[in-house]
Interface confidence: low
Amino acid sequence: EEELQVIQPDKSVLVAAGETATLRCTATSLIPVGPIQWFRGAGPGRELIYNQKEGHFPRVTTVSDLTKRNNMDFSIRIGNITPADAGTYYCVKFRKGSPDDVEFKSGAGTELSVRAKPSAPVVSGPAARATPQHTVSFTCESHGFSPRDITLKWFKNGNELSDFQTNVDPVGESVSYSIHSTAKVVLTREDVHSQVICEVAHVTLQGDPLRGTANLSETIRVPPTLEVTQQPVRAENQVNVTCQVRKFYPQRLQLTWLENGNVSRTETASTVTENKDGTYNWMSWLLVNVSAHRDDVKLTCQVEHDGQPAVSKSHDLKVSAHPKEQGSNTAAENTGSNER
C-alpha cells in the first residue's frame, strides 16, 4: 500500500475579518493509525491550533466527523477571524506511539490572509484657535486594516487638498496596519462653516470610503472689526455713540466703554446677529451727557474677543465752551483711530 500523504489543496485562503476560515486537509490512507493536529507556523515555535486527540479549541470546528473509523477528511473551520490569525497553517499527521505520538507527515501548508477594514478615520485639529491667513495642521488616523495598501485623501469643503504627508505603519509585513496623515490648511475669514474631511479607501470597503471630519468652527478665530459712530442727538446735550462690532467668531466677546480712559460700562455680547458666513455682529451704544463735560471727551470702545488682547476704536466728542448756545449742534468727530 502507498505511503500516506497529507494533502492541503489550498495554498492560500483569503478571509475577511469576522468571518470563518475553512482550512482543508485530507489524508490518502487510514494507515498509520494516529491523530491529526493543526499548527500555525513551522518549527519549534509553532502554535497548536487544533488537536484531534485532546484539548479545548472553542474557535475550531471540524468539517467532518473525525470519530468515524474511515474518516480521511481533517479539514477545520476557524471562526471569528482577526488579522492576528494570519499565517501559514499546517495539517500534521501523527503516528500512535508510546509514550507519545510521533509526527509522521505534514501537509504543504495553507497561507491564511486576512482582510480587515480600517477603523473610522479620526480627524483632530490644533489645540488652540488660529486666525485667518494662518496655516493650521490637521491629523487623521485609522487603524487595524489589512492588507497594507490604502488610499487617503484630504478635502476642504469638497476641494481636494494637496499639502499633506502620510505614513502607513509598520513599513514591513504585519497582521494589520495603521495610517497617519497630517494636512496643512490655510484659514480664510469665510471658514466658520467649513469642514475638513479625511477620506480613506481600502479594498475591504468595496468602493465606499470611510470619512472623518473636523469643523473649522472649532479651529478658527475671526477677530472683529470695530466702528464707532455718533448717532443723532436724542435730547439736548445728549449724544448717542454706538460701537459696531462686526464679523467675529466665536461669540465670546466683552466690550468696555471708556470715557477719557475711565471705564464707563462693561458688557458681554449676548443678543448677537449671525451672518451668512457664520460670523457674528453686535452693537453697543453709550448715551453721553455732553453738558456734564467741560472739555472734549475721548470715547473708546474696547473689545476683548475670545481671551485675546483687547482692540479698541476711539471717537472724539468736541465739547464747546458754551454748549447751551450751540444746542443740538454740539460738535463731534470720529477720529477713526484704531488702537491695540
Epitope: 488610499t151 487617503l152 485623501k153 502620510t166
Partner: antibody, heavy 119, light 107 residues
Framework: QVQLVQSGAEVKKPGASVKVSCKAS????????MHWVRQVPGQGLEWMGW????????KYSQKFQGRVTITRDTSATTAYMELSSLRSEDTAVYYC????????????WGKGTTVTVSS | DIQVTQSPSSLSASVGDRVTITCRAS??????LNWYQQKPGKAPKLLIH???SLQAGVPSRFSGSGSGTDFSLTINSLQPEDFATYYC?????????FGGGTKVEIK
Amino acid sequence: QVQLVQSGAEVKKPGASVKVSCKASGYTFTSNAMHWVRQVPGQGLEWMGWIKAGNAEIKYSQKFQGRVTITRDTSATTAYMELSSLRSEDTAVYYCARGDYYYYYMDVWGKGTTVTVSS
Amino acid sequence: DIQVTQSPSSLSASVGDRVTITCRASQSISDFLNWYQQKPGKAPKLLIHAASSLQAGVPSRFSGSGSGTDFSLTINSLQPEDFATYYCQQSYSTPLSFGGGTKVEIK
C-alpha cells in the same frame, strides 16, 4: 484614452542627475500609484519605486534608496523620477507605469525614456 | 526580499503550439502575481493580474494559474504576434520583483 507620456531621451555625464517626467491623462491621477521600472539594454525589468499619487506615499527599492527621488504634481497630473550620482551602469530605458492599489500590477505603461550615461 | 525565478529562460515553439511558462516565488505570495509581455523596443504589456485574472483586451488564449509559490502562464495555440519575452512579477511585498524573463522564439 488612458496614456502616460514620458519626457525625451537624455545623455548625461557620470556623477550628474537626470529627471524624467511622466504626464498622465485619461483617468483620475490620484486614484492610482505610479511605478518606475528600468531596463538595462539586453536585460530584464527592475522595479525602482512607486508613489501613490493620492497621498504621496513613496516606496523605493533598497537598491536605489538615497539616489532616487520620486515626486508628483497632482495639478499637472505628472509624476517625476530623479536619479542622482549617475554611473555608466544606469544607462537604461526608464518606464513609468500606472499601478493598481491592491495587487500592484502595472496596467498602463509609458513608452520609456532612454537615459545614456557616458563620459 | 522575495525572489522570483522564471523558467525556461527561452523556448522555441511553432504557431499553434501550446506553451507553458512557470514562475516560482521564494516564499508564499498568495495570488499577488502578474504576467507581462514585452516586444523588442516596446514597453511591457500587462496580460494577467492576480495570478489568473485576464486583463481587459487580452486574447483568451492566455491563461494564468497558481497560488502560493508556484505559478504558470499558458498560451493555447500560439499565434505569430505572441513571439515575445514574458515576465512574471510579484506584488506581494516590496521591493516588487520581476522574473528574469522567458523569450518565446519561432522554431
